[in-house]
């Protein structure tokens, strides 16, 4: 379980000099201090989540570190650079015409980012075109203070969006998960992600994915037929990173979508998901906002049963216990429910086929003034062998035309006295949600599927 030697820094991140990555698209970033570069990795992975206000779980329930706290801590550690990929930015209440005290954490984060820029820490942002929150001024404010911002025209390039949500800090620390740069992600939407500290191997590998966005964010950029060698990854499902995370033997790798943005050596996100499902022998628990065995935003809709078939095959052929927790909110597309019922219909306990589907409803309560909120936005899966934390919903577009990243982690059980493996922690978080009063069986839903909390 030795940590492998890092690739040379210059291959990974153009920090030493502003360096061309095609189309004159270099990130002009400060050189890292030699001491920082030489530090040994002592990787640490922390699960982070947002629990919406007024969503109490049973007393004594497990919880992960609050996302807002983790983000502020990450920014506190930044010394050189922060690179952020996010579908959209909306860190202030006025962005969406809302005056609500729950936006304060997002506004504090925006403030903190401005302070970083004031301390000469570089901020590079890759965001999507098309995007949501088009009235948001966050990026104008940050750009005016020196942030480098690129809108990646995924609509033109792949007919998708940039849906990834991750940070790379100082080429050493990582956040990735379901949360966009949105104040609602901190207080009004249920999110799940991971922060990895002091892990330059993985951080520099994820940086390569950031760089694929960065080079596509210049005017008139085109998708390369073959990505240049310096974008290639040596960390993938066949050669995962191996190291000690807090003393626990761990393997990990990042996957990416769509395939057109997977340079040589990068495991496509769909392949990673299918591999994790395929290796499960006891259970597959998945929590995703949306589940459609179809295309999602393209016309005409097309049937796409890849993930659906994999879940069915695991349950039917291997006796794997499948649980799928899907979100149900005011902005949920009701055409999803027949597909969920179809999947659950496979369940046949007498034949040892176990498929259970529930919907998770976040009560709106007195937060009805906040649009596109009060929803479980998580995208993760856990088996007895691995944890998968992603940024994609489960429908074709997210794997064929839209950008996303996944993190696959496996830890060896029993090696550490102090705590559970990542997959065990994630399983416990899933089971907390699954057994909570907010998780409702499909038969407990009204025929209209209006996703309103009935209490």
């Amino acid at each position: 379980w030795q940590v492998r030697c890092p690739p040379t820094w210059g291959q990974v991140q153009p920090r030493d000099v502003p360096r061309s990555w095609g189309h004159g698209s270099s990130l002009a970033l400060e050189p890292l201090e030699a001491e920082v570069r030489k530090q040994r990795d002592s990787c640490q992975l922390v699960l982070v989540e947002s629990i919406p206000q007024d969503l109490p779980f049973a007393a004594g329930s497990l919880s992960a570190q609050p996302l807002g706290q983790a983000w502020l801590q990450l920014l506190d550690t930044a010394q050189e650079s922060v690179h952020v990929a996010s579908y959209y930015w909306s860190l202030t209440g006025p962005d969406i015409g809302v005056n609500d005290s729950s936006s304060q954490l997002g506004e504090a984060l925006l403030q903190k980012l401005q302070q970083l820029l004031g301390r000469n820490i570089s901020l590079a942002v890759a965001t999507s075109s098309p995007t949501l929150a088009r009235k948001s001024t966050d990026l104008q404010v940050l750009a005016a203070r020196g942030a480098q911002v690129r809108r990646v025209p995924m609509g033109r390039l792949t007919r998708g969006v940039l849906h990834s949500k991750f940070w790379v800090v100082d080429g050493r620390h990582i956040y990735m998960g379901s949360a966009n740069m949105d104040w609602r992600s901190l207080t009004q939407v249920k999110e799940l992600g991971a922060v990895i500290y002091n892990c330059s191997h993985l951080a520099q590998d994820l940086e390569k994915t950031f760089q694929t966005y960065w080079v596509l964010g210049v005017p008139k950029a085109v998708l390369p037929k073959t990505w240049p060698q310096n974008f290639s990854s040596h960390i993938n499902r066949f050669q995962p990173f191996q190291g000690l995370f807090d003393g626990v033997p761990t393997t990990a790798y990042f996957s990416a979508s769509p395939p057109a943005l997977c340079p040589q050596g990068r495991t496509p996100d769909l392949e990673a998901l299918l591999a994790v499902m395929g290796s499960a022998q006891e259970f597959i628990y998945a929590s995703v906002m949306e589940y459609f065995p179809t295309t999602r935003f393209s016309h005409p809709r097309r049937y796409w049963p890849v993930l659906d078939n994999a879940l069915r095959a695991a349950a039917f052929s291997k006796g794997v216990r499948v649980r799928l927790l899907v979100s149900c909110g005011l902005n949920t597309d009701p055409t999803m429910f027949p597909y969920l019922r179809s999947l659950q219909a496979l369940s046949n306990p007498a034949a040892n086929v176990s498929v259970d589907v529930k919907v998770f409803i976040v009560p709106v309560g007195n937060h009805s003034n906040i649009p596109f909120s009060r929803v479980n936005h998580s995208k993760f899966m856990v088996t007895e062998k691995a944890a998968y934390i992603g940024t994609s919903n489960w429908s074709e577009d997210y794997f064929s035309s839209t950008t996303g990243v996944g993190l696959v982690v496996t830890q060896s059980p029993g090696a550490q006295p102090a705590g559970a493996t990542v997959q065990e922690q994630l399983r416990q978080l899933f089971e907390r949600d699954w057994s909570s009063r907010y998780a409702v069986g499909l038969d407990g839903q009204a025929p209209g599927q209006d996703c309103v909390w009935q209490g």
Epitope: S128, P130, G155, E290, N331, N369, H377, D450
Partner: antibody, heavy 124, light 107 residues
Framework: DVQLQESGPGLVKPSQSLSLTCSVT???????YYWTWIRQFPGNKLEWM?????????NYNPSLKNRISITRDTSKNQFFLKLNSVTTEDTATYNC?????????????????WGAGTTVTVSS | DIQMTQTTSSLSASLGDRVTISCRAS??????LNWYQQKPDGTVKLLIY???RLHSGVPSRFSGSGSGTDYSLTISNLEQEDVATYFC?????????FGGGTKLEIK
């Protein structure tokens, strides 16, 4: 099949209020869309007037802000336009339409269903 | 407000022709543009959304393109049923705004 149908008086006197109803069938107005009024002036110019959202919130064209109100009756699946202090300049064909879909994460919004329109003449 | 301009208010073409209708925005609308068809009887139909995406049920002879401030709708093989007025509309910001329309007739 989703259908929208406008109704209301075809003739309104200047300085009075114009009131129209849009009746929606085949879809609940409390779901997933902005329920919108758009008018077309003689000569074809289209003007977006405003909407009532699935959640009951409103947004209006600033050019009409002091005169316009859009409300709804969810029990009848109808939404309404009220335009105060009309002048002859408000003579137009008034259409209701839905804009969306407002699903999580969807950045593509459009008016995918339109009513046939109702002509309103403002004249004394 | 963003002004949308369709400089050609009417045009006539022969059956089978390739017809292009253009639309210009007063500022960059980042591809947030839709096209509608209004038939002589007044019925309005969505054709294309987000610059180039064909809406369900729309014949493939319709296509859209453009970026920044300049956009166009193309009908590749004009048919009699395409006689109509075509409008562009931006959804980049509120208020939504429409072009003045281009009336298409058959020669």
């Amino acid at each position: 099949d989703v259908q929208l149908q406008e109704s209301g008086p075809g003739l309104v006197k200047p300085s009075q209020s114009l009131s129209l109803t849009c009746s929606v069938t085949g879809y609940s107005i409390t779901s997933h869309y902005y329920w919108t009024w758009i008018r077309q002036f003689p000569g074809n110019k289209l003007e977006w007037m405003g909407y009532i959202s699935y959640d009951g919130s409103n947004n209006y064209n600033p050019s009409l802000k002091n005169r316009i109100s859009i409300t709804r009756d969810t029990s009848k699946n109808q939404f309404f336009l009220k335009l105060n202090s009309v002048t002859t300049e408000d003579t137009a064909t008034y259409n209701c339409a839905r804009e969306g879909p407002l699903y999580y994460g969807n950045p593509y919004w459009y008016f995918d269903v339109w009513g046939a329109g109702t002509t309103v003449t403002v004249s004394s | 407000d963003i002004q949308m301009t369709q400089t050609t208010s009417s045009l006539s073409a022969s059956l089978g022709d390739r017809v292009t209708i253009s639309c210009r925005a007063s500022q960059d609308i980042d591809n947030y543009l839709n096209w509608y068809q209004q038939k002589p009887d007044g019925t309005v139909k969505l054709l294309i959304y987000y610059t180039s995406r064909l809406h369900s049920g729309v014949p493939s002879r319709f296509s859209g393109s453009g970026s920044g401030t300049d956009y166009s709708l193309t009908i590749s093989n004009l048919e009699q049923e395409d006689v109509a007025t075509y409008f562009c509309q931006q959804f980049n910001t509120l208020p939504r705004t429409f072009g003045g329309g281009t009336k298409l007739e058959i020669k």
